[in-house]
């Protein structure tokens, strides 16, 4: 239950608090996923030197990872709630194939990788509920996703490490932008 305004006492009987609003629930869920990404990034950085690679070097990749742009209406200037919500949901749906790719990429954080994937599905569901009347949301083609997954898994070890790092970094940035935008809604 959410904390009531001004309440910070230690031992209280259950107050008749309000249930979490849709926005509060989404906010908590994004933070949950971000904490998972941090754990996965930690393992990736310990395992390879990708985290030290320059942004320029990492940018030389052919991954089509979702990214927020000015036209998406999620930034403070030109903010548009409906356009932005569509972008967030569409972006998360596009990230799903990359999160599937991550599933076999971790040893000690295998459960976290699964939790991030599952929680993203839950987040999409929470957001779709918020965007009930928006019909501009396109779902990626399963066949396209399947061939992309096969292609990513066929890369050599160095490229797989690079891909893992890029997915985590991009997903973190996308979620952080989404969190900021959603707090304005």
């Amino acid at each position: 239950a959410p904390v009531l305004p001004g309440e910070d006492s230690k031992d209280v009987a259950a107050p008749h608090s309000q249930p979490l609003t849709s926005s509060e629930r989404i906010d908590k869920h994004i933070r949950y996923i971000l904490d998972g990404i941090s754990a996965l990034r930690k393992e990736t950085c310990n395992r390879s030197n990708m985290c030290e690679s320059s942004k320029e070097a990492l940018a030389e990749n052919n991954l089509n990872l979702p990214k927020m742009a000015e036209k998406d209406g999620c930034f403070q200037s030109g903010f548009n709630e409906d356009t932005c919500l569509v972008k967030i949901i569409t972006g998360l749906l596009e990230f799903e194939v990359y999160l599937e790719y991550l599933q076999n990429r971790f040893e000690s954080s295998e459960e976290q990788a699964r939790a991030v994937q599952m929680s993203t599905k839950v987040l999409i569901q929470f957001l779709q509920k918020k965007a009930k009347n928006l019909d501009a949301i396109t779902t990626p083609e399963p066949t396209t996703n399947a061939s992309l997954l096969t292609k990513l898994q066929a890369q050599n070890q160095w490229l797989q490490d690079m891909t893992t790092h890029l997915i985590l970094r991009s997903f973190k940035e996308f979620l952080q932008s989404s969190l900021r935008a959603l707090r304005q809604m």
């Epitope: 910070d8 006492s9 008749h16 608090s17 629930r25 949950y32 904490d35 998972g36 941090s38």
Partner: antibody, heavy 115, light 107 residues
Framework: YPQLVESGGGLVQPGGSLRLSCEAS???????MSWVRQAPGKGLEWVGS????????YYNDNVLGRFTISRDNSKNTLYLQMNSLRAEDTAVYYC?????????WGQGTLVTVSS | DIQMTQSPSSLSASVGDRVTITCRAS??????LAWYQQKPGKAPKLLIY???DRYPEVPSRFSGSGSGTDFTLTISSLQPEDFATYYC?????????FGQGTKLEIK
């Protein structure tokens, strides 16, 4: 490893104390958490919950004043300190993520209060 | 506190049957209701939240409906793995309260 793992259960005499732990993965650091219990062969009962910072705790009336929920975010661990235990506190105790509904649960730890 | 009453408390059915479990709240709780499935010796698993939203990866044969005081969990075609105990929970106000459970057994 599982995301939530409870420990600390066991046999304790009436009037005694016990501290349960719930080791959580890092994902739960910014989450409200709850303890839920289940007496043998009975239904589920919410015990109480705690805010992410640990600054606010909420309890069911039947444990208020006897049980204390706390957390140590540096250790990713949630605690349930149980004092003045009674026979009716005998149950499997679960920790769970609290989004008002509980979407992730530990496997539970059994607490038996008996002389 | 809000009381949650589930019916029936136990139910025998066969694979392929359509099954309905009901949950009644002692006062209006809007759609703040969740359904869980629990198997012996295991933790509960969330099936439905907000009255009718299926949690991801829960099979589509499970559906929830209702608002206010009366709620229903329906399993459209029972599968062998569905034999378990089902609980409803209100989160309209704390203390959160659960129904007493419905044990679904094989006929």
């Amino acid at each position: 490893y599982p995301q939530l793992v409870e420990s600390g259960g066991g046999l304790v005499q009436p009037g005694g104390s016990l501290r349960l732990s719930c080791e959580a993965s890092v994902l739960f650091k910014h989450q409200d958490m709850s303890w839920v219990r289940q007496a043998p062969g009975k239904g589920l009962e919410w015990v109480g919950s705690i805010s992410p910072s640990g600054g606010s705790t909420y309890y069911n009336d039947n444990v208020l004043g006897r049980f204390t929920i706390s957390r140590d975010n540096s250790k990713n661990t949630l605690y349930l300190q149980m004092n003045s235990l009674r026979a009716e506190d005998t149950a499997v105790y679960y920790c769970a993520r609290d989004l008002d509904f509980m979407d992730e649960w530990g496997q539970g730890t059994l607490v038996t209060v008996s002389s | 506190d809000i009381q949650m009453t589930q019916s029936p408390s136990s139910l025998s059915a066969s694979v392929g049957d359509r099954v309905t479990i009901t949950c009644r709240a002692s006062q209006g709780i809007s759609n703040y209701l969740a359904w869980y499935q629990q198997k012996p010796g295991k933790a509960p698993k969330l099936l439905i939240y907000d009255g009718d939203d299926r949690y991801p990866e829960v099979p589509s044969r499970f559906s929830g409906s209702g608002s206010g005081t009366d709620f229903t969990l329906t399993i459209s075609s029972l599968q062998p793995e569905d034999f378990a105990t089902y609980y409803c929970q209100q989160y309209y106000s704390t203390p959160y309260t659960f129904g007493q459970g419905t044990k679904l057994e094989i006929k």
